[in-house]
Interface confidence: low
């Protein structure tokens, strides 16, 4: 099984111990650690972080103590802007020039392939985002033409039905990425107005969204039902939870709400906790299982979160390997608890440890 | 009771076109579940024709054999579901069967919780 | 499209026999096997779900197994009510149901 990890390089940023450089990773964890995110920039693929390059080469010295471990970049994310990438993929010229750039890019830096971030294309990009899926893996077979070893291309994709609907041609762009990650998470958020878990497996009988979609089985099977191969679909299990603040004393699923819950002492962003937040957040909590949902969730004053801990990803992975899927993939590394200080395991990366174990058992 | 109630079939001529009807009681149609029809020619296993997610979503599936002629509908307020066929053939000849999926999760795959008795559509000149 | 090939079309046994039904489905369908039994004039009846779960209410003496492309079906002591005819369907997509349905398996006295 594939187990595709996400760095992120502003995780550097974060302050004191929430501060992760990719020397902190741990080389024989995933089979692939995806870089995050790479810029585009007069249609050329580009650097983002002014120490990006430098970040670059740690990541991928990783591989001179283990030559399985395959590295991507990834490029677009949140603040590249759908736009941008709407200009280059639907204009031929800078499509062409986009696509020329990234292989050499790819190749001084070190990396094994490329993963696509358009997050998400328009309703009118559909057919122009499986053209640039479609010109980049002809470019990247061409490209390996001498003897080299193929570059791969993946693409994270929503999870979200009405996304899937409007921006994918899955049945086309399956034939041509090596891999498919499917981010399921973030199915519920602040703008709801209740309580609710932002990765659930199931849509479980507790689910108070008024749809069927917004959990982890409806938009595996509907990506299968689509023509994604389950041997291309990596599944994506999140390192973080999404958090409430309660608007009253009711506490359960559906609870009513009057925001996102309050900023991480380290990420630093309302409604959003890095799983070693969370670890913190647990001292003095209550915990409840959804059942239905196999998933956790946490409460104290008025702060209610939604999370994985190792239990719940563990029926994910269960789950995955019933469905016969790819593998799983996490976002991300430096959201889970790196240094194995937060959560009294004396264990780094314990989440993405348990979703390694989990794959390996028989 | 939970139930499910086919009627509408009888002797139709080939090209011709029927509607068939499946009233449920005990749960309601716009609830979280696939309705299919599955049919049976005399003497022969069982054959799929498509499901429809009766929920909020417009899902629907059919079989090639079907598509373009048979179309799956709802009715909310009567609680029915809809089997409408056209340029129906000799080879359509079958008991028409409505079946319930098992509603609110994926888990174990999809199977067919729920029955009807079955109509019986005899196309014949 | 995802075909099932159940086996035997027909057998012959006797009141307290063990028999056993298999179907084999043309691509993997991971545990998303279902089994039905049918008696003449009658619906369908859900007998076992994902592979090996017992529906409500189905006596024990059946049992289910197999992951991927191979299951089988199992009734561990024939009773006279077992006399049925069996059919196989994959649960897995929604998508390559043509047709989802094995043949049957048709269980006779002997």
């Known amino acids: 099984y594939k187990l595709v990890c996400y760095y992120t390089s502003w995780s550097q940023y974060r302050e004191g111990d929430g501060s992760c450089f990719p020397d902190a990773l741990d080389r024989f964890l995933c089979t692939h650690i995806i870089y995050s995110f790479a810029n585009i920039s007069n249609d050329h693929i580009d650097t983002w972080e002014w120490n990006d390059v430098t970040l670059y080469g740690m990541l991928n010295t990783l591989k001179n103590r283990n030559p399985n471990l395959k590295t991507l970049l990834s490029v677009g994310g949140w603040n590249f802007g759908s736009q941008r990438f709407s200009k280059i993929a639907s204009n031929t010229q800078s499509r062409r020039t986009f696509i020329k750039s990234v292989p050499p890019f790819l190749r001084t830096h070190g990396f094994d392939g490329l993963d696509l971030a358009w997050l998400y294309p328009g309703r009118r990009d559909k057919q122009h985002f499986t053209t640039l899926i479609k010109e980049m893996k002809a470019e990247f077979i061409k490209e390996a033409q001498p003897g080299k070893k193929q570059l791969l291309l993946s693409a994270a994709l929503s999870a979200g039905k009405v996304t899937i609907d409007s921006s994918y041609d899955i049945a086309k762009i399956s034939q041509h990425l090596d891999f498919i990650s499917i981010m399921t998470y973030d199915f519920h958020g602040a703008w709801r107005g209740t309580t609710g878990h932002h990765s659930p497996l199931f849509r479980g009988q507790e689910d108070a969204s008024p749809d069927r979609f917004s959990n982890t089985d409806y938009a595996v099977g509907y990506m299968l039902r689509l023509g994604a191969p389950a041997s291309k679909l990596v599944m994506g299990i999140p390192t973080f939870g999404r958090s409430f603040t309660l608007a009253s004393s009711e506490t359960g699923v559906g609870a009513p709400i009057s925001g996102p819950g309050i900023p991480g002492r380290f990420t630093k962003e309302a409604g959003t906790l890095a799983y070693y937040e969370i670890c913190d957040f647990l001292r003095g909590a209550t915990v409840h299982r959804i059942l239905g949902q196999q998933v956790p969730y946490a409460t104290k004053g008025n702060q209610w979160v939604g999370y994985d801990d190792q239990e719940s990803v563990k029926s994910k992975v269960q789950y995955l390997k019933d469905r016969q899927l790819a593998g799983a993939m996490v976002w991300a590394l430096d959201l889970d608890d790196f240094q194995g200080s937060f959560c009294g395991q004396d264990l780094r990366f314990p989440l993405t440890n348990a979703i390694k174990d989990a794959l390996a058992a028989t | 009771e939970v139930q499910l109630v086919e009627s509408g079939g009888g002797l139709v001529q080939p090209g011709g076109s029927l509607r068939l009807s499946c009233a449920a009681s005990g749960f309601t149609i716009s609830s979280d579940y696939y309705m299919c029809w599955v049919r049976q020619a005399p003497g022969k296993g069982l054959e799929w024709i498509g499901c429809i997610y009766i929920g909020s979503g417009t899902d629907t599936y059919y079989a090639d054999s079907v598509k373009g002629r048979f179309t799956i509908s709802k009715h909310n307020s009567k609680n029915t579901l809809y089997l409408q066929m056209t340029s129906l053939r000799a080879e359509d000849t079958a008991v028409y069967y409505c079946a319930r999926d098992k509603g609110w999760s994926n888990a174990w795959g999809f199977y067919f919780q729920l029955w009807g008795q079955g109509t019986l559509v005899t196309v014949s000149s | 499209d995802i075909q099932m090939t159940q086996s035997p079309s027909s057998l012959s046994a006797s009141v307290g026999d063990r028999v056993t039904i298999t179907c084999q489905a043309s691509q993997s369908i991971g545990k998303y096997l279902n089994w039905y039994q049918q008696k003449p004039g009658k619906a369908p009846k859900l007998l076992i779900y994902?592979?090996?779960s017992l529906a409500s209410g189905v006596p024990s003496r059946f049992s289910g197994s197999g992951f991927g492309t191979d299951f089988t079906l199992t009734i561990s002591s024939l009773q006279p009510e077992d006399f049925a005819t069996y059919y196989c369907q994959q649960g897995y997509s929604y998508v390559d149901l043509e047709n989802g349905f094995g043949g049957g398996t048709k269980v006779e006295i002997k």
């Open positions: 994902s592979s090996s």
